[in-house]
Amino acid sequence: KKVVLGKKGDTVELTCTASQKKSIQFHWKNSNQIKILGNQGSFLTKGPSKLNDRADSRRSLWDQGNFPLIIKNLKIEDSDTYICEVEDQKEEVQLLVFGLTANSDTHLLQGQSLTLTLESPPGSSPSVQCRSPRGKNIQGGKTLSVSQLELQDSGTWTCTVLQNQKKVEFKIDIVVLAFQKASSIVYKKEGEQVEFSFPLAFTVEKLTGSGELWWQAERASSSKSWITFDLKNKEVSVKRVTQDPKLQMGKKLPLHLTLPQALPQYAGSGNLTLALEAKTGKLHQEVNLVVMRATQLQKNLTCEVWGPTSPKLMLSLKLENKEAKVSKREKAVWVLNPEAGMWQCLLSDSGQVLLESNIKVLPTWSTPVQP
């Protein structure tokens, strides 16, 4: 007996061939001997089976002695043995229909779990193997689960169902809802305008939800909500904003925040959360602000940074075009009695300058000028 595997919702074509290459009488029946379809002269005839409106054939093949049974919009319960009667012969075909669906929505938040459930006909014992877009393989029986979804899990999952040495392939598109970056860091000189951007790693027709930016300033004992906003069909509207600092927010995606001035008291870490409508859980992106200040007071030239810096970052003070006068893995460096000229304060990581501030030191009889 020939075995054919089908996919729920798809169309399957079961073949039946006669030795005579001409249009002759044929009938297709199910295992209960109920007629599905056949031919009578120029007409296609249908029986009282439950497949009635979904069963078909292709008349163009009849003259070649081929009498297919086409079943559209397959259902699991279409799994059966189908019998083709032609030229006093009977051909049997066993059809097994499988379905593979994602547990809930195919749009899942980063860190959530994906469960794929296999629907199969009674008596079958299929095995399933799925390959994620990043090439990870998972195997299982009726259900397959992947916990802690990552951004790289977004895309087409290819799942192969194996039964009776035959296989059928399913493709399921999964969208992992996340920000493009889990964390970002912004380096600014004191007084500069700060731009924070929170691009999403997915696109959807309509995006609705609400969000908030909590800020933990390095100098503050507790965190503070800087801004709350709503998102409706990709349009951003501010609900509440602190007076200090008075953040501005872009009205369109990607989420964009502007801090008018980088000041030492704002240096620290923020956590932007976004709760999406009809989703449990929130999207998170961490953002860090490092602020640099170079000052000269009396005979002391000082360079300081505030905010979350890595211990391997180097802070240096150097006279332009000269070797560094002082270079330390600390958050403040200074030079006593600095020579006149343009001094540079540099924050660097393995030789790469992240932040630079220049200060002009005048001869001792005059006051300093900050460019």
């Epitope: 009578q40 002269g41 120029s42 007409f43 296609l44 005839t45 249908k46 078909d56």
Partner: nanobody, 116 residues
Framework: EVQLVESGGGLVQPGGSLRLSCAAS????????MSWHREPPGKGREWLAD????????DYLASVKGRFTISRDNAKNTLYLQMDSLKSEDTGVYYC?????????WGQGTQVTVSS
């Protein structure tokens, strides 16, 4: 009363084109798959093309595939057969019919003659 009325037949030169129409009435046309058949002179009736109720799926006799196009307009209760690159062997009476029996509906036919 169920009626299928074919029109658009006539005399055409080899290589020419014709468009046949079949006006349906007396039944729910949009629910039935339909067909075109022809009866060449002195021969039996042969099936040419099928179209499903929505117009999404079509099927053709090998000798007319690529030359003939079956289509339908459910809003106008009309079935069409566009015939291009006509040959002398396409001569005959053309009939529209329901694809299935039941209901087994037939039209009265329209004559197509391909001759130079």
């Amino acid at each position: 009363e169920v009626q299928l009325v074919e029109s658009g037949g006539g005399l055409v030169q080899p290589g020419g084109s014709l468009r046949l129409s079949c006006a349906a009435s007396g039944f729910t046309f949009s629910k039935l798959a339909m067909s075109w058949h022809r009866e060449p002179p002195g021969k039996g009736r042969e099936w040419l093309a099928d179209i499903d109720s929505s117009g999404d799926t079509t099927d053709y006799l090998a000798s007319v595939k690529g030359r003939f196009t079956i289509s339908r307009d459910n809003a106008k209760n009309t079935l069409y057969l566009q015939m291009d690159s006509l040959k002398s062997e396409d001569t005959g009476v053309y009939y529209c019919a329901s694809r299935e029996d039941p209901p087994g509906y037939w039209g009265q036919g329209t004559q197509v003659t391909v001759s130079s």
